[in-house]
Interface confidence: low
């Protein structure tokens, strides 16, 4: 009696079980009563990553340099190419189909987390006692200068965008 189901790594066709092609190979012809499944390796720019009965291999992903992409891991006959973003850019999506430049933190904000190839810069407002006077993708909020440690006094208070201004203490006359 012909089978209704096949073992793992097999498929049912014309009332018989044929072997699937292994990863990295595509199906050329199904098995028959007298011949085994015929498979062929994928070409250099193609891949198949599962046991399959595909008649065409998949094209490797193209890491488009004009979209800021570069190859992180070259594809093989069994794996797709993995793209990542060039330095200074990060992916716009999980599948990393294009990249955008890292955001800069504006004055009054500092970098909480530096951007990576897959995540943007995370900025945070400078808390009281800290400032940032630059637009930067890597500078944290800096602490206000401590005038006291320099034997000076605060002449102008700091803000989230400016440092304090220190000046000499007024000398008391006798």
């Amino acid at each position: 009696e012909p089978p209704t189901a096949c073992r793992e790594k097999q498929y049912l066709i014309n009332s018989q079980c044929c072997s699937l092609c292994q990863p990295g190979q595509k199906l050329v012809s199904d098995c028959t009563e007298f011949t085994e499944t015929e498979c062929l390796p994928c070409s250099e720019s193609e891949f198949l990553d599962t046991w399959n009965r595909e008649t065409r291999c998949h094209q490797h992903k193209y890491c488009d340099p004009n979209l800021g992409l570069q190859v992180q891991q070259k594809g093989t006959s069994e794996t797709d190419t993995i793209c990542t973003c060039e330095e200074g850019l990060h992916c716009t999506s999980e599948s990393c189909e294009s990249c955008v430049p890292h955001r800069s933190c504006l004055p009054g904000f500092g970098v909480k987390q530096i951007a990576t190839g897959v995540s943007d810069t995370i900025c945070e407002p400078c808390p009281v006692g800290f400032f940032s006077n630059v637009s930067s993708a890597f500078e944290k909020c800096r602490p206000w200068t401590s005038c006291e440690t320099k034997d000076l006094v605060v002449q102008q208070a700091g803000t989230n965008k400016t440092d304090v201004v220190c000046g000499p203490q007024d000398r008391q006359r006798a």
Epitope: Y62, D64, P65, N66, L67, G68, P101
Partner: antibody
Amino acid sequence: QLQLQESGPGLVRPSETLSLTCSVSGASMNTNNYYWGWIRQPPGKGLEWIGSGYYNGNTYYNPSLKSRVTISVDTSKNQFSLKLNSVTAADTAVYYCARQTPPRIIGSPNIWGQGTMVTVSS
Amino acid sequence: DIQMTQSPSSLSASVGDRVTITCRASQSISSYLNWYQQKPGKAPKLLIYAASSLQSGVPSRFSGSGSGTDFTLTISSLQPEDFATYYCQQSYSTPPITFGQGTRLEIK
């Protein structure tokens, strides 16, 4: 010197497909340095980017038009084409083809064709 | 999509005037901003790319500045051939490339 020249019918009926071709002379399109794009300008209005094609077959479209647009690049003929289906009067515009330079992401259209007026009317 | 807003929509000026056109992006676009000039019946012409770089062959009276969300195009001394419509365009987050609505520069 690089030149781009649009060609195609100046009148298209509503609901039909607008087809334009851009012929490139003075340089090979078979290069990874440029995208080949289409931009349109309705009478008296501003510029709207339609999409771009790349020599390897990659295409990038304006999401607002994506469902109706096909751009293809034929490097053997040094041409690229635009197809816009299901047109309405709102698609009446001057259509420009352009070479786009990368600043990484699909960049500045820096060399343009002279434009061709397409009217959608019955 | 990133929206680009130009101001003013139109302005009148005289030959020799210094003219400034501004462009604002709906979110930060770093320096990924370009400026175009378009004359009636003609294709746009790239003047400035990457916010402040002058395209080859463009007169030095044109200059661009800004980064983030606010940008300006300045013509230091207006010439008769400068009367045209000017567009800004972002290429930071694409597709799509987006243009400003244009600024029409007329003779006073």
